[in-house]
Interface confidence: low
């Protein structure tokens, strides 16, 4: 904490610029009028000021909206928001798009910091649901910001907002949240042709059920290694070997060199030894001739 | 109740071979499959493979490629590991594991001290 | 391969304080193939939590797990006299299988 001093003669700040730099602590503190400090927080950004004096320039703030910035005030943080804790962050009530853009430019090239990730959860839940615009934004700036969601708030995606997702938006989503974007998606691209609806819905298909991936067998959509080692372990086990051969389409030799990664790996040691080399790749790993399958989750469904 | 027991400690030359049984009681063996994890003194662990029980399929770690050979007897209820050409830095305390639920390890036998010296 | 790494690799804390250990992966890990091991002196392993965040059988309510992605959490509520041990991460996402180096929580 700063100790609280006079200002020397002489130095009390009429401007926030760049003659601020040569202030120790105590005298920025002492001398610099929290409520000028507000009202030209947009020349904070465009001047050099150390870590410690952006730590006074902070307190000053806090001391002048203890309830949280207004958003006159936060739209100008620039660098100042990195110092700001995700318990500031909460005070705060952030409506704006513009505001959001700002603050996340501020942190663009890093990992999302527990700042950030509290700015946009308030950013949000004032919103009401994860619109179009709002997607558009934090996926251009976090490519991962979907897959950082839980279940449960990804459930307030509006199918409209698919449309804003991007392959690269997905790439570390979990089962979990594909499985509650992947109905969205069906629902946003239902409208569209076959290859067109195929090549939206490919990224969404790590939740896709068995019953859609058979039907998708049926279209000729050659899907590629990439996205069948996504799907679902789960959903790709019933597939039979022909299925998975309509699926893949030329694709299917890519199975040799994935067969010890889930999920083939799994997917062959339910597949018959006959039906594996039926695909001449030498897939090892089935289940012998004369061998007797028994679907143990039926037997226990039943129990 | 469920658990894996492990043959004992062994002493062996640089060049020779160690087998390892595991003898698992109280579950259905053929349902999970036998995991093998090594572990030198001081150090971690280090996965070196596993084999399916009710089919015999195996995966080894590539490091160890060549070298190791996992089996069960189902009859018995017992897995096995043969390690081949023992160097001195196999010398480790050897477990293995069931693969259990999410193929997370969820028994362990005691494990088997394996010292290869010369 | 995958590689695991734990941090920190000592954790000096005493009985009843919170523990919190990290686990980070090479390459993104789904959270259903991420597990947390313990391991005293002298005795095998024992699974503590699989899938990320589900306990295993018998396992105190204590332990919990978190993260996504490449970044994955150990934490223990309040330290037990019993809990000072090794703690290691595993991935089998992808194979080879791999452990993380270990984190030892040792009495202060």
């Known amino acids: 904490e700063v100790e609280k001093t006079a200002c020397p003669s002489g130095k009390k700040a009429r401007e926030i610029d760049e003659s601020l730099i040569f202030y120790k602590k105590w005298e920025l503190e002492a001398c610099v009028d929290a409520a000028l400090l507000a009202t030209q927080m947009d020349r904070v950004n465009a001047i050099p000021f150390t870590y410690e004096q952006l730590d006074v320039l902070k307190h000053k703030l806090d001391e002048l909206y203890p309830q949280g910035y207004p958003e006159s005030v936060i739209q100008h943080l620039g660098y100042l928001f990195l110092k700001m804790s995700p318990e500031d962050i909460r005070k705060w009530n952030v409506t704006s798009l513009e505001t959001l853009k700002a603050l996340l430019e501020v942190n663009k090239g890093h990992e999302m910091s527990p700042q950030v990730a509290t700015l946009i959860d308030r950013f949000v839940k004032g919103r009401g649901q994860l619109d179009k615009d709002t997607l558009d934004t934090l996926t251009a700036f976090y490519p991962g910001y979907l897959c950082s969601l839980s279940p449960e708030e990804l459930s307030s995606v509006p199918p409209s907002s698919i449309w804003a997702v991007r392959p690269q938006d997905l790439d570390t989503c979990d089962p979990r949240q594909l499985d509650v974007l992947y109905p969205k998606a069906r629902l946003a691209f239902q409208n569209m042709n076959g290859s067109e609806y195929f090549v939206k819905i490919q990224s969404f298909l790590g939740g896709a059920p068995t019953e859609d991936l058979k039907a998708l067998s049926q279209q000729n959509v050659s899907m590629d290694l990439a996205t069948f080692m996504k799907l679902r372990t789960d959903a790709v086990l019933p597939l039979t070997v022909a299925e998975v051969q309509k699926l893949l389409g030329p694709h299917v030799e890519g199975l040799k060199a994935e067969e010890r990664h889930r999920p083939v790996r799994d997917w062959i040691l339910r597949q018959r030894q006959d039906d594996l080399d039926t695909l001449g790749l030498g897939l090892q790993g089935g289940i012998p001739n004369g061998y007797l399958v028994l679907d143990l989750s039926m037997q226990e469904a039943l129990s | 109740q469920v658990q894996l027991l492990q043959s004992g400690a062994e002493v062996k030359k640089p060049g020779a071979s160690v087998k390892v049984s595991c003898k698992a009681s109280?579950?259905?063996?053929?349902?999970?499959?036998i995991s093998w994890v090594r572990q030198a003194p001081g150090q971690g662990l280090e996965w070196l493979g596993w084999?399916?029980?009710?089919?015999?399929?195996?995966n080894y770690a590539q490091k160890l490629q060549g070298r190791v050979t996992m089996t069960t007897d189902t009859s018995t209820s017992t897995s096995f590991m043969v390690l081949r050409s023992l160097r001195s830095d196999d010398t480790a305390v050897y477990y293995c594991?069931?693969?259990?639920?999410?193929?997370?390890?969820?028994?362990w036998g005691q494990g088997t001290m394996v010292t290869v010296s010369s | 391969e995958i590689v695991m790494t734990q941090s920190p690799a000592t954790l000096s804390l005493s009985p009843g304080e919170r523990a919190t250990l990290s686990c980070r992966t090479s390459?993104?890990?789904?959270?259903?193939?991420l597990s947390w091991y313990q391991q005293k002196p002298g005795q095998a392993p024992r699974l503590l939590l699989y899938?990320?965040?589900t306990r295993a059988t018998g396992i105190p309510a204590r332990f919990s797990g978190s993260g996504s992605g490449t970044d994955f959490t150990l934490t223990i509520s309040s330290l037990q006299p019993e809990d000072f041990a090794v703690y290691y991460c595993?991935?089998?996402?992808?194979?080879?299988?791999?452990f993380g180096g270990g984190t030892k929580v040792e009495i202060k």
């Open positions: 595993q991935q089998d996402y992808k194979l080879p299988l791999t």
């Open positions: 594991a069931r693969v259990g639920d999410s193929d997370a390890f969820d028994i």
């Open positions: 084999i399916t029980a009710y089919n015999r399929n195996t």
């Open positions: 109280g579950y259905t063996f053929t349902t999970y499959g």
């Open positions: 390459q993104s890990v789904f959270n259903s193939f």
């Open positions: 899938g990320t965040s």
